[in-house]
């Protein structure tokens, strides 16, 4: 029987900057029951807070809601573990939450086969960012990725949009149907889940691009 | 505790490429971004660029680009630079550093000497 | 990209003195989330950087209290009290507010 070995902080995400979640990786147990307590403190201030919600993220977790969210301080906070044989604690960790966001998938994900007459064809996909994404403050710069493929196939075609909400892609093959999907992820932040996914039938008159 | 290990020296030869490893340990090597940074003897220090080896992402410093290329693999937690083209102007000290989840670095490696002479 | 000016390059102390080290960047540093990426590194002859201060005024884990820092906007000051002989080396101003991310050019602090 020991005390508890060191315990990490391994993950923080945030949805949308207004509250944000961290997980930690226990370390060995000691053979014993053990306790996780997080604490924590916002630059420039010295009190240690107690994490204030164990619960919604999970095991080994705490979540920050509303009222304990801050974007213009960093927080440092470290893990202490405690069985009957003694503690030990993880390395301070600081999040600044500006660089933890991991948005919903983007919305509306629209796709359309276009047949201009005097251009090659193309399809044309189009998308929203997520709702709770606030995009007017100018901090917040969603990059995009969408992925596509034929029904059948194993490997996905990658194309990365920039931050753009709409995308031409020329190169199909014609008869088949295609799964499309987006994600998105903000300049140093995380990306999304891929969206839920759109079919589209290629027509088979549809032209290769050369 | 967090390290980040990186070779003493490297000697090359102009025209040609190197490529600098960064090897972490002590923490979870997908977490944290790794920024890579310059310094010419007894001069200042330029950021290269970052990369995020969850997921490989990258931003280079605009200067840099066609000249570092950042990549990380993931089953040794080591992080790569490779410098191509080199000439005179390439020899320096190459640090590479961690950041939390901040767009800050507190953790550094101890830097290596890269000199270009034929 | 924005250019960091510090001042004095060379600043000779007695040990036990004050020394101020001057920060200037060619435009505001204030992020558009409200932060000021300013922080302060000292590196010691041979070594690697060290982070003494993140985000203009907030000293990093285990440095001492002895070190501080101000500042807004484009103006940012490193006061060191009391300077003892572990405090030498060069001390270098960097922004992460804007990318690429830049430094200055270093204040070398030395015995007068």
């Known amino acids: 029987q020991l005390p508890p070995g060191k315990p990490e902080i391994f993950k923080c995400r945030s949805p949308n900057k207004e509250t944000f979640t961290c997980w930690w990786r226990p370390g060995t147990d000691g053979g014993l029951p053990t306790n996780y307590s997080l604490t924590y403190h916002r630059e420039g201030e010295t009190l240690m807070h107690e994490c204030p919600d164990y619960i919604t993220g999970g095991p080994n977790s705490c979540h920050f809601g509303k009222q304990y969210t801050s974007m213009w301080r960093t927080y440092i906070m470290m893990v202490n573990a405690t069985n009957q044989m003694g503690s030990s604690f993880s390395d301070e960790l600081y999040v600044d939450v500006t660089y933890i966001v991991q948005p919903d998938p983007p919305l509306e994900l629209a796709v359309e086969v276009k047949q201009p007459e005097d251009r090659k064809p193309y399809l044309w996909i189009k998308w929203s960012p997520p709702t709770l994404i606030d995009l007017k403050t100018g901090w917040f710069t969603l990059l995009y990725e969408i992925r596509l493929k034929p029904e059948k196939a194993a490997e996905w075609e990658i194309h990365f949009a920039g931050q753009q909400t709409e995308f031409k892609i020329l190169s199909l093959h014609p008869g088949q149907k295609y799964l499309v999907q987006v994600r998105c992820k903000p300049d140093h932040g995380y990306w999304s889940a891929w969206s839920p996914a759109t079919f589209i039938q290629i027509p088979s008159d549809f032209t290769m691009n050369d | 505790q967090v390290q980040l290990q990186q070779p003493g020296a490297e000697l090359v030869m102009p025209g040609t490429s190197v490529k600098l490893s960064c090897k972490a340990s002590?923490?979870?090597?997908?977490?944290?971004?790794i920024h890579w940074v310059k310094q010419r003897p007894g001069q200042g220090l330029e950021w290269i660029g970052e990369i995020d080896p969850s997921d490989s992402y990258t931003n280079y410093n605009q200067k840099f680009k066609g000249k570092a290329t950042l990549t990380v693999d993931r089953s040794s937690s080591t992080a790569y630079m490779q410098l191509s083209s080199l000439t005179s102007e390439d020899s320096a000290v190459y640090y590479c550093?961690?950041?939390?989840?901040?767009?800050?670095?507190?953790?550094w490696g101890q830097g290596t000497l890269v000199t270009v002479s034929a | 990209d924005v250019v960091m000016t510090q001042t004095p390059l060379s600043l000779p102390v007695s040990l036990g003195d004050q020394a101020s080290i001057s920060c200037r960047s060619s435009?505001?540093?204030?992020?558009?989330?409200?932060?000021?990426?300013l922080h302060w590194y000292l590196q010691k002859p041979g070594q690697s950087p060290k982070l003494l201060i993140y985000?203009?005024?907030n000293r990093f884990s285990g440095v001492p209290d002895r070190f501080s820092g101000s500042g807004s906007g484009t103006d940012f000051t490193l006061k060191i009290n009391r300077v003892e002989a572990e405090d030498l080396g060069v001390y270098f101003c960097s922004q992460s507010t804007h990318v690429p991310f830049t430094f200055g050019s270093g204040t070398k602090l030395e015995i007068k």
């Open positions: 002590g923490y979870t090597f997908t977490s944290y971004w």
């Open positions: 435009q505001s540093l204030v992020h558009s989330n409200g932060n000021t990426y």
């Open positions: 985000k203009v005024s």
């Open positions: 550093g961690r950041s939390f989840f901040t767009n800050w670095f507190a953790y």
